[in-house]
Interface confidence: medium
């Protein structure tokens, strides 16, 4: 089993649709179960949960360039939700996402109809097959949702979308 998310980071516009792509290949002839999971960014104190509070541990983490403080922390330090699952042709939305225009298309791509404020974070595409347990069964994409902002207006003119006050 091999799961690949082609876009590692995706920037999309508030209240606009987006598709998070996921490809997989498998030797199994059984239908795969596709699940998309959302993980919020880590809290500022995620260093404690990783045992990185000591000066020595902080120095170690700085040397480890693969460690990303936004993304790398225990799930207990952030929000984790099932967005949607697909088994055969049946797509089921997680409780939090019920009522939203979200579905799984083209085997494993997550299609979101209208991005909301809290949608920024890490999305995991997880594939389960009953008789192909070897290889890599998940991959992730980071989604950043932006509104129309003066700071970006002349750099990214396409960010001309609606925003909603709190």
């Amino acid at each position: 089993l091999q799961v690949t998310v082609p876009d590692k980071k995706k920037v999309a516009m508030l209240f606009q649709p987006t598709v998070l792509r996921c490809h997989f290949s498998t030797s199994s002839h059984q239908p795969a179960v596709v699940q998309w999971k959302f993980k919020s960014y880590c809290q500022d104190r995620m260093g404690e949960s990783l045992g990185m509070s000591s000066p020595r541990a902080q120095a170690l983490s700085k040397r480890n360039l693969e460690w990303d403080p936004y993304l790398d922390c225990l799930d207990s330090r952030r929000t984790v939700r099932v967005v949607a699952s697909k088994q055969g042709s049946t797509v089921t939305l997680g409780d939090f996402y019920r009522g939203r225009e979200i579905t799984i298309v083209h085997d494993a791509d997550l299609q979101i109809g209208k991005l909301m404020w809290g949608d920024s974070g890490l999305y995991y595409c997880i594939i389960t097959t009953p008789d192909d347990l070897e290889g890599k069964n998940e991959d992730s994409v980071e989604l950043l949702v932006l509104g129309r902002t003066g700071l970006l207006a002349d750099l990214l003119p396409s960010f001309a979308v609606e925003i909603m006050p709190e």
């Epitope: 508030l14 949702v145 509104g147 129309r148 902002t149 003066g150 970006l152 002349d154 609606e162 006050p165």
Partner: antibody, heavy 120, light 112 residues
């Protein structure tokens, strides 16, 4: 409660550079934009530039283009503003300010300010 | 650059009385999404600025409801329904439509 804590006051010679830091705590650094604003003694507020740390994109006011560099270190939730070729008129209090994405341009939290004095 | 002009420069007010500050921009701050990219800040003596109003009329978290923002396009107003002693300081409007983000010159509110 979000806090932005800035580095201490600096006295610099004309022609030199200064680097001011701004450490964020009590919120997810990834969800914000950081801007730098300065205020000369007895004067109003002047926007210098800003950065969206998660994108690594910075934008500068034309007036400071080529002299200012704004960066952010995700691993320490710290933003930096470096101003080079200092002159006496750069004497000011320098503030960092945080704006929540997806908007980012209204600043709901400010640092305490860093006084930079440029004098020979 | 968008030029922001505030008036009056100085505003002496008796506690309990209303106050009004005007801000005018050199070009419209009304974007096609229907929002005015205009924010108001207050800088109390010896302190950092604090956000009062964003997007023309939205009160920031924790800001008393005696503060209100109105206006559209190029003309904006910050109103304080009943001024209190703690409201003294310099009020700034700022446009966030495009960079460079620019501020008005400030209005100093003082207690009479």
């Amino acid at each position: 409660q979000v806090q932005l804590v800035q580095s201490g006051a600096e006295v610099k010679k004309p022609g030199s550079s200064v680097k001011v830091s701004c450490k964020a705590s009590g919120g997810t650094f990834s969800s914000y934009a950081i801007s730098w604003v300065r205020q000369a003694p007895g004067q109003g507020l002047e926007w210098m530039g800003g950065i969206i740390p998660i994108l690594g994109i910075a934008n500068y006011a034309q007036k400071f283009q080529g002299r200012v560099t704004i960066t952010a270190d995700k691993s320490t939730s710290t933003a930096y503003m470096e101003l080079s070729s200092l002159r006496s008129e750069d004497t000011a209090v320098y503030y960092c300010a945080r704006g929540r994405l997806p908007y980012g341009d209204f600043w709901d939290s400010w640092g305490q300010g860093t006084l930079v004095t440029v004098s020979s | 650059d968008i030029v922001m002009t505030q008036s009056p420069l100085s505003l002496p007010v008796t506690p309990g009385e209303p106050a009004s500050i005007s801000c005018r921009s050199s070009q419209s701050l009304l974007y096609s999404n229907g929002y005015n990219y205009l924010d108001w800040y207050l800088q109390k003596p010896g302190q950092s600025p604090q956000l009062l109003i964003y997007l023309g009329s939205n009160r920031a978290s924790g800001v008393p409801d005696r503060f209100s923002g109105s206006g559209s396009g190029t003309d904006f107003t910050l109103k304080i329904s009943r001024v209190e002693a703690e409201d003294v300081g310099v009020y700034y409007c700022m446009q966030a439509l495009q960079t460079p983000l620019t501020f008005g010159g400030g209005t100093k509110l003082e207690i009479r």
